[in-house]
Amino acid sequence: ESGYAQNGDLEDAELDDYSFSCYSQLEVNGSQHSLTCAFEDPDVNITNLEFEICGALVEVKCLNFRKLQEIYFIETKKFLLIGKSNICVKVGEKSLTCKKIDLTTIVKPEAPFDLSVVYREGANDFVVTFNTSHLQKKYVKVLMHDVAYRQEKDENKWTHVNLSSTKLTLLQRKLQPAAMYEIKVRSIPDHYFKGFWSEWSPSYYFRTPEINNSSGEMDPI
């Protein structure tokens, strides 16, 4: 005998790996928070599977997730954001696996935006600036940013700079002359809130000036 049940989908389903991961986004839509969960195994048959969150909620005991293709999603104002919630994968009334999670420790910030690079001829440097919606938020205000840049021809040679402000200066002498560069930025919660890196901002492309042969300096673009 194999030792495996042969009579029905639920018993077979219990042999599957229902590991899942989640991230929260606070004040992602006005004062609404969101919680997104997905299975770590992309091959899990999700047809009859639902997600439910219980505990550390305002006015209600539990909330059900909406299914959007292969992800599960809640948008609500009802997260208490103190203590742990119990997030369960369910088939009907049966819980297959659960995790206790503090939603303030799985925060994924919104991606930075409005990334731009301005060359300062007199200073021989590039001023990188970007914006983040978190400056206006009431919860997650303190972020660490990761600015990554590379020469366009160097596929995987990214240089990373971590900073807590939204402005960075790159010295011209640290970059190759007359080269096209790609730059992008992402953010992660810092301090009280914990969590994950945001998506990358859209990339910005800029060209460094050529070297002026007489002075050894770069020409402006």
Epitope: I82, K84, D102, K138, Y139, K141, V142, D190, Y192
Partner: antibody
Framework: QVQLQQSGAELVKPGASVKLSCKAS????????MYWVKQRPGQGLEWIGE????????NFNEKFKSKATLTVDKSSSTAYMQLSSLTSEDSAVYYC???????WGQGTLVTVSA | DIVMTQSHKFMSTSVGDRVSITCKAS??????VAWYQQKPGQSPKLLIY???TRHTGVPDRFTGSGSGTDFTLTISNVQSEDLADYFC?????????FGAGTKLELR
Amino acid sequence: QVQLQQSGAELVKPGASVKLSCKASGYTFTNYYMYWVKQRPGQGLEWIGEINPSNGGTNFNEKFKSKATLTVDKSSSTAYMQLSSLTSEDSAVYYCTRRSFAYWGQGTLVTVSA
Amino acid sequence: DIVMTQSHKFMSTSVGDRVSITCKASQDVGIVVAWYQQKPGQSPKLLIYWASTRHTGVPDRFTGSGSGTDFTLTISNVQSEDLADYFCQQYSSYPLTFGAGTKLELR
């Protein structure tokens, strides 16, 4: 129910070190960050730092970086704080508290005196 | 570091009164602020978090308000057991910082 039980009062000499303990019960110890807070007699509260009991990762208030060492013993669900090179400025009540600040230990009084 | 300033070290009140304790942050902390009550010889007790959310079991005569840099803890219908020290705290940015405290005493 959640409880944080701290070690008893300590009388220590200047220049010495002391190790305070905070035993957690009523919850899964590794699931919650632990904070340590200092309160000098008749004064306000100062955050010393945090430790993640699941991996031992710490963050400190710069002011206490060279003063305090935070550790945990997962097997006994206990958090520890060692204070070194003690001076009279370190005489205070020290509290452990869970990250949400909803649960606090009863505090340990440390008196530094020759 | 963010400085939390409680302008009144002492506040006098009478049983049945309404009293407001204020706290000002040196920079914008959103609503990432908590209020604590502490009685002599006891540990601080969490009253309010997220600036206005009452902690479990805290009587509804305690109300928190404010956002950004200005925060208020209001106790309506003060009871004798409310006579204590009250501290505000920001937990938006490390190091977490507390106000110096306001002692609520009987007039």
